[in-house]
Interface confidence: medium
Amino acid sequence: QPDAINAPVTCCYNFTNRKISVQRLASYRRITSSKCPKEAVIFKTIVAKEICADPKQKWVQDSMDHLDKQTQTPKT
């Protein structure tokens, strides 16, 4: 779970060790603050839970790509 040390900075100290299906993901945000010990991705799931994930893992990158495509406005 992400941990807010000093609002508004949220950091991740541990990453999930389970792949989350993209069908269970609603959105994500990147954690790049120098105040945090490591770079991270926080996924928000469809049941409103927030999960820390390692941005170096392929499934995390693929999931971010998938969510990016979902949120892009269709070109007309």
Epitope: R18, K19, I20, S21, V22, Q23, R24, T45, I46, V47, A48, K49, I51
Partner: antibody
């Protein structure tokens, strides 16, 4: 340790309703979902539906749509399954089981409640 | 709905033998969101394997799961007397969740 304790056995008349409860202890109730699964005598497992209190989602199998209602009371960490218009084919053991809303495997199960529908 | 078909319906084996149970899905189970349960008479099912291949807490190493897409396997490397039971597969990626019809592992 997580424990799910279900209400006791019921004998019901055809056409009536039954409400089975499932009280959870040893975990954060609102962070998990509860599925209901039934098993007719000598038969396999049949998924009926699920509720995820955190998200407010409820899902039902088409077969039970309109006859089953799954609810949850976070204040008492209890989930309920009500099945109406009972018929003899509804005679079964009804189980509640916990799942993590992000994933979905059923990691803890209640002991089961036998519902007998007989005239 | 995803239909899960388990085979064989019954497996007659002796203690110490290897058991291989199959579960085939009518469509792909995305991200291998498939579980295996063991059920003994008069008891509730018990989770053995989740995400197709991860052992649940406290499950002996003789139980292993494999597979992806539409074909999944539960293997019991060497049957112990307490392993004779009914085994069910379960997909939890789509609603409605569905179970296979079960495979009974009985003593030969």
């Amino acid at each position: 340790q997580v424990e799910l304790v279900q209400s006791g056995a019921e004998v019901k008349k055809p056409g009536s309703s039954v409400k089975v409860s499932c009280k959870a202890s040893g975990g954060t109730f609102s962070s998990y979902g509860i599925s209901w699964v039934r098993q007719a005598p000598g038969q396999g497992l049949e998924w009926m539906g699920a509720i995820n209190p955190l998200a407010g989602h409820t899902h039902y199998a088409q077969k039970f749509q309109g006859r089953v209602t799954i609810t949850a009371d976070e204040s008492t960490s209890t989930a309920y399954m009500e099945l109406s218009s009972l018929r003899s084919e509804d005679t079964a053991v009804y189980y509640c089981a916990r799942y993590d809303g992000i994933y979905g495997e059923l990691d803890f199960w209640g002991q089961g409640t036998l519902v007998t529908v007989s005239s | 709905d995803i239909v899960l078909t388990q085979s064989p319906a019954t497996l007659s084996l002796s203690p110490g033998e290897r058991a291989t149970l199959s579960c085939r899905a009518s469509q792909s189970v995305s991200d291998a969101y498939l579980a295996w349960y063991q059920q003994k008479p008069g008891q509730a099912p018990r989770l053995l394997i989740y995400d197709a291949s991860s052992r649940a807490t406290g499950v002996p190493a003789r139980f292993s799961g494999s597979g992806s897409g539409t074909d999944f396997t539960l293997t019991i490397s060497s049957l112990e007397p307490e392993d004779f039971a009914v085994y069910y597969c379960h997909q939890y990626i789509f609603y409605p969740n569905t179970f296979g019809q079960g495979t009974k592992v009985e003593i030969k």
